[in-house]
């Protein structure tokens, strides 16, 4: 336990007094928190928490899902923790298969271990396929496996967490990585026609095509020198991964002379913005 000056509040004391504890499945977990100002135990695994207001945490028949971090907190807000592994040969991994990665960021494959003494904790491709050569990862038995700097090419990559147990490779359930692309260029915008000459009463219809890597791109039709958002109809398509197209059609059913002017199709993403204009001239 950390040493403190007399009179200063100190963190609670936990028995057994070790940072990690390994118990077998079916055995008892018995954790005692000693502190005159005891408040609660908190159990945490896969970022989910449970609380217990008794100073002795007892689980009579431990299961793999009891693996996790047990934290005792006192009234001063000071705490102490012990990590319990419940060794279950039939359930080596606890998993949350939701797996999203933002391009160029790290992402965590959530497959913490129930037994820290297995070896070669790593990622493997599904169906015996190799992982991409540039995929780097850092394993942490208590959290999972961190994939470093996710690439766009990893989208829909199928993988397993893997360990060696008694000389055999054991795989977790499948994870499928969904990659959200980073915007690395401005949207591409084009217009069906650069200028229109219409008679009064005729219909004005113009289509702006916006292309980008994802549907998160923002677009709107505006009248130049006006902030008013115009009514438009949108259709959109995904032409495979990271190839998104939106068509925004602006319609004035019966054009009037005072509708004449410049109309701008504006699009932006987190990288920047782009616009294209079309000119309408209405004559009577």
């Amino acid at each position: 336990q950390p040493s403190v000056s007399p009179g200063e509040p100190s963190p609670p004391s936990i028995h057994p007094g070790k940072s990690d504890l390994i118990v077998r499945v079916g055995d008892e977990i018995r954790l005692l928190c000693t502190d005159p100002g005891f408040v609660k135990w908190t159990f945490e695994i896969l970022d989910e928490t449970n609380e217990n207001k008794q100073n002795e945490w007892i689980t009579e028949k431990a299961e793999a899902t009891n693996t996790g971090k047990y934290t005792c907190t006192n009234k001063h807000g000071l705490s102490n923790s012990i990590y319990v592994f419940v060794r279950d040969p039939a359930k080596l991994f606890l998993v949350d298969r939701s797996l999203y990665g933002k391009e160029d960021n790290d992402t965590l494959v959530r497959c913490p271990l129930t037994d820290p003494e297995v070896t070669n904790y790593s990622l493997k491709g599904c169906q015996g396929k190799p992982l991409p050569k540039d995929l780097r990862f850092i394993p942490d038995p208590k959290a999972g496996i961190m994939i470093k700097s996710v690439k766009r090419a990893y989208h829909r990559l199928c993988l397993h967490c893997s360990v060696d147990q008694e000389g055999k490779s054991v795989l977790s359930e499948k994870f499928i990585l969904k990659v959200r692309p980073a915007f690395k260029a401005v949207p591409v915008v084009s217009v069906s026609k650069a200028s229109y000459l219409l008679r009064e009463g005729e219909e004005f219809t113009v289509t702006c095509t916006i292309k980008d890597v994802s549907s998160s791109v923002y677009s709107t039709w505006k009248r130049e020198n006006s902030q008013t958002k115009l009514q438009e109809k949108c259709n959109s398509w995904h032409h495979g991964d990271f190839n998104y197209e939106r068509q925004a059609t602006l319609t004035i059913s019966s054009a009037r002379v005072n509708d004449s002017g410049v109309f701008m199709c504006y699009a932006n993403n987190t990288f920047g913005s782009a616009n294209v204009t079309t000119t309408l001239e209405v004559v009577d």
């Epitope: 970022d47 928490t49 939701s98 933002k102 169906q127 199928c158 499948k174 499928i176 959200r180 998160s216």
Partner: antibody, heavy 117, light 111 residues
Framework: QVQLQQPGAELVKPGASVKMSCKAS????????MHWVKQTPGQGLEWIGV????????SYNQKFKGKATLTADKSSSTAYMQINSLTSEDSAVYYC??????????WGQGTLVTVSA | NIVLTQSPASLAVSLGLRATISCRAS??????????MHWYQQKPGQPPKLLIY???NLESGVPARFSGSGSRTDFTLTIDPVEADDAATYYC?????????FGGGTKLEIK
Amino acid sequence: QVQLQQPGAELVKPGASVKMSCKASGYTFTSYNMHWVKQTPGQGLEWIGVIYSGNGDTSYNQKFKGKATLTADKSSSTAYMQINSLTSEDSAVYYCARERDTRFGNWGQGTLVTVSA
Amino acid sequence: NIVLTQSPASLAVSLGLRATISCRASESVDIYGNSFMHWYQQKPGQPPKLLIYLASNLESGVPARFSGSGSRTDFTLTIDPVEADDAATYYCQQNNEDPYTFGGGTKLEIK
């Protein structure tokens, strides 16, 4: 235990906007994606969008893009959805739902939004 | 968008018998053998409750009377035997592809 708390009802005027909350407890808020779902008798259940864990990126159903805005306040473990330019078609029950292990494992009780002059 | 079509829209089943609800997707919701299809139960005034995830996995705490099957585009929720408490509306949902979509629902009445 995981809980998602939503206010029961909001009465708003046409043309106004409403910002509803979803307060999360029982888990690390920044580690899970939060989705929003609209339910009306006519249209059934419709996915509005998601705010992703950690960095607050969002993804929207195209139908609700520009209509709904999803945000989150990490310090209070609360997700928010703002709906603007309200019309009678926005009258519905709106749910927040936490994604866990690929599915919507936890739902709020829902906020009934009534748009009426 | 992936369209999910549920059938029937409503059905009435006698207590103790089997109820079968179908959900057909307009395109495959499978990736590498994982079917991103889930089933929910909803009772009036309550949020949807997860029953089955990834096509065939029973959610913790859900009675074993509920089961799910299917892959790619065709999925089935089976309740066998039906109990009085199962009167509700059932929805399928896919999250293989944005935007995530729900089926139109099947209202189950117990006779």
